[in-house]
């Protein structure tokens, strides 16, 4: 019962997490114009992975997609890749985990098969969560770098007479959605892995070494027997890689009306 609950909860948490990763990837607010300590402007700029938008005080919002692939910063491409890999792995993981759910009967599927599928989906969720967290973190790191760079030369004067105020960008809502969603997917994956251990049928492991004496067929079995509880030394710890990178964001931007500026 506890195993079923753990598996079910893991699935639900992962489902919410993956939905969040998809939402974050599609959102336009990855970076938003920093309003603190800046002159009050009648426009509000914000940028996503796929397009950048400008919301005017008038009520108009204009968004422009990044219609180039080669002209985009490598780090933006890297973040896109990490998020898409995260979504794909998560979607496959969800598909696998549906069939692995203990409460769902599919033909005469053995518990061992369900356990393997649960473990597979769990690992997929963990990697998916890590991809999302890595992608969002890379973008955040890039924002921090660019923020301080633009702060250092915030006013670029022409002979000290005319001033051009540089638009600084700070963390957008999508980053927080991505971090939370990635974390949830990761937690869901861990729960699936824990559930897998409880699903695995009881096994007996015999580690035998045969010694052949001349003229006799005697087998010596050292170490006796070890009953596998599912938590014994037979379980392998897999190390999940943590993708890392650095980012750069340089982007630009039809109308919907929302209140903002």
């Amino acid at each position: 019962m506890a195993v079923t609950a753990c598996q079910g909860l893991g699935f639900v948490v992962s489902l919410i997490g993956i939905a969040g990763i998809i939402a974050a990837t599609c959102m336009d607010q990855w970076s938003t114009q920093d309003l603190y300590n800046n002159p009050v402007t009648a426009v509000f700029n914000y940028q996503g992975l796929w397009r950048s938008c400008v919301r005017e005080s008038s009520g108009f919002t204009e968004c422009r997609g990044y219609f180039t692939l080669l002209g985009l910063p490598a780090m933006l491409q890297a973040v896109r890749a990490l998020m898409i890999v995260g979504i794909v792995l998560g979607a496959i993981g969800l598909l696998v985990s549906i069939f692995a759910l203990k409460c769902i009967r599919i033909g005469s599927m053995e518990d061992s098969a369900k356990a393997n599928m649960t473990l597979t989906s769990g690992i997929m969720f963990i990697v998916s969560g890590l991809c999302a967290i890595a992608g969002v973190s890379v973008f955040a790191n890039m924002l921090v770098t660019n923020f301080w760079m633009s702060t250092a030369n915030m006013y670029t004067g022409m002979g000290g007479m005319v001033q051009t105020v540089q638009t600084r960008y700070t963390f957008g809502a999508a980053l927080f959605v991505g971090w939370v969603a990635g974390g949830l997917t990761l937690i869901g994956g861990v729960m699936m892995c824990i559930a897998c251990r409880g699903l695995a049928p009881e096994e007996t492991n015999y580690k035998a070494v045969s010694y052949h004496a001349s003229g006799h067929s005697v087998a010596y079995k050292p170490g006796g027997f070890k009953a596998s509880t599912g938590f014994g030394s037979n379980t392998k710890n897999k190390k999940i890689y943590d993708g890392g990178a650095r980012t750069e964001d340089e982007v630009q931007s039809y109308p919907s009306k929302h209140d903002y500026v």
Partner: antibody, heavy 118, light 113 residues
Amino acid sequence: EVKLVESGGGLVQPGGSLKLSCAASGFTFSDYGMAWVRQAPRKGPEWVAFISNLAYSIYYADTVTGRFTISRENAKNTLYLEMSSLRSEDTAMYYCARLGRGNSFAYWGQGTLVTVSA
Amino acid sequence: DIVMTQSPSSLTVTAGEKVTMSCKSSQSLLNSGNQKNYLTWYQQKPGQPPKLLIYWASTRESGVPDRFTGSGSGTDFTLTISSVQAEDLAVYYCQNNYYYPLTFGAGTKLELK
């Protein structure tokens, strides 16, 4: 057709109060930012106040901050400007304007005259 | 506050003549997000409210004759009337639509010779 009609202007003594109204029609009022602009006799226009479509953002010109209050009632398609502690320099034609692309004042009313005099 | 400086303050022209007026802002009105300049030009005739001519420094409002052209970027802007007509005699104002307060220039008065 976009139509903006201002009302509420008149003669008022210095230190007095007045409330201007602007009735809007011909567009979805709650979709657009609105502003008040005034023009003193033989002078150029002067932006007074701005209110965003859902009234989350409100800005005032330094000369009127603390004395004037802009508000809107989207259900009634009406924009207001409440003026208090009026001074002689507030004498002007007050226009209501609807913002358009580029934050331009795309549509203007015919104005209502406010005269502050003893 | 952003200071908008218009020049000349008045212009005396003859019908059919090409006219150019200038507007300078104390800070750049270019928004990096969409690479658009938030400067607007208005025309005001006596006893009437100002009428929108050009927004985003160079985009003509619908219904505005194509003899009116806006140009410029950053801090320096120009309004050009390719062939002045009698009905164009008015005061022309530029406005900063980027920073609050949304300041206007003092205007350029177009008069007939």
